[in-house]
């Protein structure tokens, strides 16, 4: 079957796989006149890899809490047994009622865009529900994900999130919208309002049009022992143990303390949804306790003291002292001052010596004072804040915060590439390619100090020499290396990087990028001498910029062959001279040749070679450049992209036969010598014809 080039270009030629995994087809190329020999197009078929999703794809979350995704929720696998690290989820549509984030990253950062199955297995992918202002009983969120692992086809997945007060939540013991307890002065009365006790989330399970005729019935199952509950000034008792959410909302529920001490009080209750006029409805219910704290009327509330942030390295443990948490309270013992964790950061947890390994959520000032309370930095090295509430058991809780700054255990200065200085400029800005500090995350606040300066230049900020600079200045392109001495093609300097109390040193290498145009073209014929001219090496731009004649010094190479100066005319004595130095002018005059040698000790065939040159010009630093080229056995039928000054001996003999023709002109830089241009006049006339005509 015949296929045209335009069909190929148009993507109309398809390969359909059938049979074995390895195979292909033979083809010939033809332009209508000439036909190439046969070619073989190899095709390797891959077994189709299929991705599959297991797991419930549903996540139940307690209101206002953080829940990790687990393998029970989301478990991807592939028919090829792909490493979980390579099973990538992309978040196509993020959650609406909360956010998705990575446990090891700053939880205040942007929303997660992608994550791997391995991270799910590690419990590092977290869903955090954000409490809305309006009460609800059950809310539903969805995450749209795309699972991919090339070469398999992507798979779309939807993760359903159910946020429900029905769930048993260790971090939220109440099933009600609010059950915060009450503070009442000794012997006095206090109103229990919806700020303290609110079951309107039970009502939220009823569609809003019918909600006004529904209510929540509270039945007191254990009455306060040191006071009395009143509804609209009517006492509640065993014979009348009920009150309604609507009465709570109207401010009709009151607790009256009977006096005689400041012991704790409270009541137990059952709450359930009721329909219009108390009819039965299949709504939620809960049994809970409401705490009432009686405080001494004369008591002075505790005064929190200023807190110093706790600083410790990642992976370590540090005691919390009075510098971090302390209060002034003349009428409370340290053991009576209680702290409760309201919200913990994700960079570690608090633990009590002798209190087990797990995190603690309650502790006293006595625990702090005795050094029993410690922070364990098991998360990433980010700053975090504990939101605490502190109370002496007699005053309303006061909010407090404890800042924890996790320092990296070590930092690394990443040097991705040496600093390249353009030759004609002699200066260049440093970037993140040269200097970037990472710990377990990037350290954008890093600072650098020069501990060993460069030999041939200066570091500048704002045009002035400096020995200290910041990552921010690097990122803004403000830190510049400038050569001050034009005698070396490279330099280096050593810096000490400091990030969050940890340091590391690194050496930055500086190289000069030659302002040189190098073009080797296709392969060059072995055994031939070719002309080195501005089509191959050109420092003309450097000459213009420096108003000088650039000089080249051969540092190395070629391995097989040599650079030679060719005689100007046949009257010039001697053959070609070996060259170690030359100028741009020599290149422009066509005075240079490259004798391309054959690799010894092996069968003839393609090879690679190179020249390493140092390029000098007035007023700029030198630069090292290389000319890499491929070589092959001479092929008389092949058009070469450089001017040939001579061809191999064998080819010349062939060319001397009667049927060979004499060239009439010089091959241009891109012209070729299909037949060796060595005719009756011998080698010198070949040179004359090619170089000086």
């Amino acid at each position: 079957r015949t296929r045209s080039g335009s069909q190929l270009d148009g993507g109309l030629v398809l390969f359909s796989h059938r049979g074995t995994l390895d195979g292909g087809f033979r083809f010939r190329l033809s332009d209508g006149e000439h036909t190439s020999p046969g070619h073989f197009f190899r095709v390797t078929a891959q077994k189709q890899v299929l991705l599959s999703l297991k797991g419930s794809q549903t996540l139940t979350v307690c209101p206002g809490s953080v829940q990790p995704l687990s393998s029970q929720t989301l478990r991807a696998s592939s028919s090829a047994g792909t490493d979980p690290q390579l099973l990538l989820y992309r978040v196509v549509r993020g959650p609406q009622l909360g956010r998705l984030f990575h446990a090891q990253q700053d939880s205040t950062g942007e929303a997660l865009v992608n994550f791997t199955q391995a991270e799910v297995y590690a419990g590092n992918i977290l869903y955090e529900h954000e409490m809305p202002p309006e009460p609800f009983w059950e809310a539903h969120d969805t995450l749209e994900l795309q699972l991919s692992s090339p070469p398999a086809r992507d798979v779309a997945a939807t993760l359903a999130v159910a946020v429900s007060f029905e769930a048993a939540c260790p971090q939220r013991p109440s099933h009600l919208w609010k059950n915060k307890g009450l503070w009442v002065p000794e012997g006095q009365r206090a109103r229990i309002t919806v700020a303290a006790l609110d079951a309107s989330n039970l009502l939220a399970s009823v569609p809003s049009p019918q909600r006004s005729e529904h209510d929540v019935l509270f039945q007191v199952t254990q009455f306060p022992s040191r006071g009395q509950l009143l509804v609209s000034e009517e006492p509640l008792h065993a014979g009348q143990p009920h009150f309604l959410q609507s009465q709570l909302a109207a401010g009709q529920l009151v607790y009256a303390h009977g006096g005689g001490g400041t012991q704790q009080d409270g009541f137990h209750f059952r709450a359930h949804l009721q329909g219009p006029a108390g009819a039965s409805v299949a709504g939620p219910q809960t049994s809970e306790a409401f705490a009432i704290t009686v405080r001494d009327v004369n008591e002075r509330p505790p005064q929190p003291q200023a807190s110093v942030p706790l600083r410790l390295t990642r992976g370590s443990r540090a005691p919390i002292s009075r510098a971090q948490l302390s209060v002034v309270d003349p009428d409370s013992a340290p053991g009576e001052i209680e702290y409760e964790v309201q919200r913990a950061p994700h960079n570690g947890f608090l633990s009590l010596v002798g209190g087990g390994l797990g995190p603690v959520t309650r502790f006293t000032q006595a625990d702090v004072d005795s050094g029993r309370l410690a922070f364990v930095a098991n998360g990433s090295s980010v700053a975090g804040i504990f939101q605490l509430s502190m109370s002496d058991g007699a005053s309303p809780p006061l909010p407090m915060s404890l800042a924890v700054d996790i320092l990296p255990s070590a930092i690394e200065v990443q040097l991705r590439a040496p600093l390249e200085v353009p030759q004609a400029l002699g200066r260049s800005s440093l970037s993140q390619q040269q200097l970037r500090v990472v710990s377990d995350r990037e350290e954008p606040e890093a600072a650098y100090r020069l501990i060993q300066g460069p030999q041939y230049g200066h570091l500048l900020v704002g045009g002035r020499p400096t020995s200290a600079f910041s990552q921010f200045q690097i990122d803004q392109g403000e830190v510049v290396f400038a050569f001050t001495n034009s005698s070396s093609s490279h330099d280096h300097f050593r810096v000490l990087a400091l990030a969050r109390g940890v340091n590391a040193s690194a050496v930055v290498n500086v190289t000069v990028r030659a302002l040189l145009h190098v073009w080797a073209g296709g392969p060059w014929p072995q055994g031939a001498t070719l002309r080195l001219d501005p089509t191959v090496l050109d420092a003309g731009e450097l000459a213009n910029r420096t108003d000088s004649v650039p000089r080249f010094r051969l540092l190395e190479g070629p391995r097989h062959g040599r650079v030679v100066r060719v005689p100007r005319a046949r009257t010039e004595p001697g053959g070609s001279q070996l060259v170690e130095q030359f100028t741009q002018q020599d290149l422009e005059d066509g005075r240079l040749g490259l004798e391309v040698g054959r690799p010894e000790g092996r069968a003839p065939g393609p090879a690679g070679d190179s020249l390493t040159l140092e390029l000098w010009a007035q007023g700029v630093p030198p630069a090292v450049a290389s000319l890499d080229f491929a070589t092959e056995p001479y092929n008389a039928a092949r058009p070469y992209s450089v001017a040939l000054l001579s061809v191999p001996e064998a080819a010349r003999t062939e060319a001397g036969k009667p049927e060979s023709s004499t060239p009439t002109g010089e091959p241009g830089p891109m012209a070729s010598s299909p037949e060796p241009a060595v005719a009756k006049g011998g080698f010198l006339s070949f040179l004359e014809a090619n170089m000086f005509s």
């Epitope: 005729e213 006029a277 039965s280 709504g283």
Partner: antibody, heavy 117, light 113 residues
Framework: QVQLVQSGAEVKRPGASMKVSCKAS????????IHWVRQAPGQGLEWMGW????????NYAQKFQGRVTMTRDTSTSTVYMELSSLRSEDTAVYYC??????????WGQGTLVTVSS | DIVMTQSPDSLAVSLGERATINCKSS????????????LAWYQQKPGQPPKLLIY???TRESGVPDRFSGSGSGTDFTLTISGLQAEDVAVYYC?????????FGPGTKVDIK
């Protein structure tokens, strides 16, 4: 203490309307539903409907739908029950009852309405 | 509508003896969510309005003597007067307060033998 005081007995002609009142005292009027229950002579109890004094919302038994209207006056803590198109079988003692949940904890003394030509 | 039936229609019991009244609903009045039976018992003496004795099938109203007790679940309920007194002579009604229309049983008349 909680009291529900109803209006006095009435005699009505068939086809006429009647309006019985129920005045509440001793508690927060708007906190509790008022139901109306009737009892024909020598018969059992029959629930007619309820009114929420707070919102004015009502719910009537299907049997009385279209004939009964329950209203309230929060300024006097009084609930009214009007029954139209009276027939002889509407002769009964009409009770108002206070409820919080759906049981009736307090009752009025009852109003006898006699429908007779 | 939920239909309530009572048995017996009437009973005569000696003073100090136990009186048992049964009540049956045509459908369950148990709310499985809060595990409550929405059933109440009332006592009515001649010329008086009814008086609440029991609600939620077994919870005695304040001030009601403890000789009155309620039991049962779902559709079958019982009111027991453990030691009948002279003042207990009355008609006893059960009522479902599960859903509207709230309905009463036809009543059971209790007399002294």
């Amino acid at each position: 203490q909680v009291q529900l005081v109803q209006s006095g007995a009435e005699v009505k002609r068939p086809g006429a309307s009647m309006k019985v009142s129920c005045k509440a005292s001793g508690y927060t009027f708007t906190n509790y539903y008022i139901h109306w229950v009737r009892q024909a002579p020598g018969q059992g109890l029959e629930w007619m409907g309820w009114i929420n004094p707070n919102s004015g919302a009502t719910n009537y038994a299907q049997k009385f739908q279209g004939r009964v209207t329950m209203t309230r006056d929060t300024s006097t803590s009084t609930v009214y029950m009007e029954l139209s198109s009276l027939r002889s079988e509407d002769t009964a003692v009409y009770y108002c009852a206070k409820s919080w949940v759906s049981w009736f904890a307090s009752w009025g003394q009852g109003t006898l309405v006699t429908v007779s030509s | 509508d939920i239909v309530m039936t009572q048995s017996p229609d009437s009973l005569a019991v000696s003073l100090g003896e136990r009186a048992t009244i049964n009540c049956k609903s045509s459908q369950s009045v148990l709310n499985s969510k809060n595990n409550r039976n929405y059933l109440a018992w009332y006592q009515q003496k001649p010329g008086q309005p009814p008086k609440l004795l029991i609600y939620w099938a077994s919870t005695r109203e304040s001030g009601v003597p403890d000789r009155f007790s309620g039991s049962g679940s779902g559709t079958d309920f019982t009111l027991t007067i453990s030691g009948l007194q002279a003042e207990d002579v009355a008609v006893y009604y059960c009522q479902q307060h599960y859903s509207t229309p709230f309905t009463f049983g036809p009543g059971t008349k209790v007399d002294i033998k």
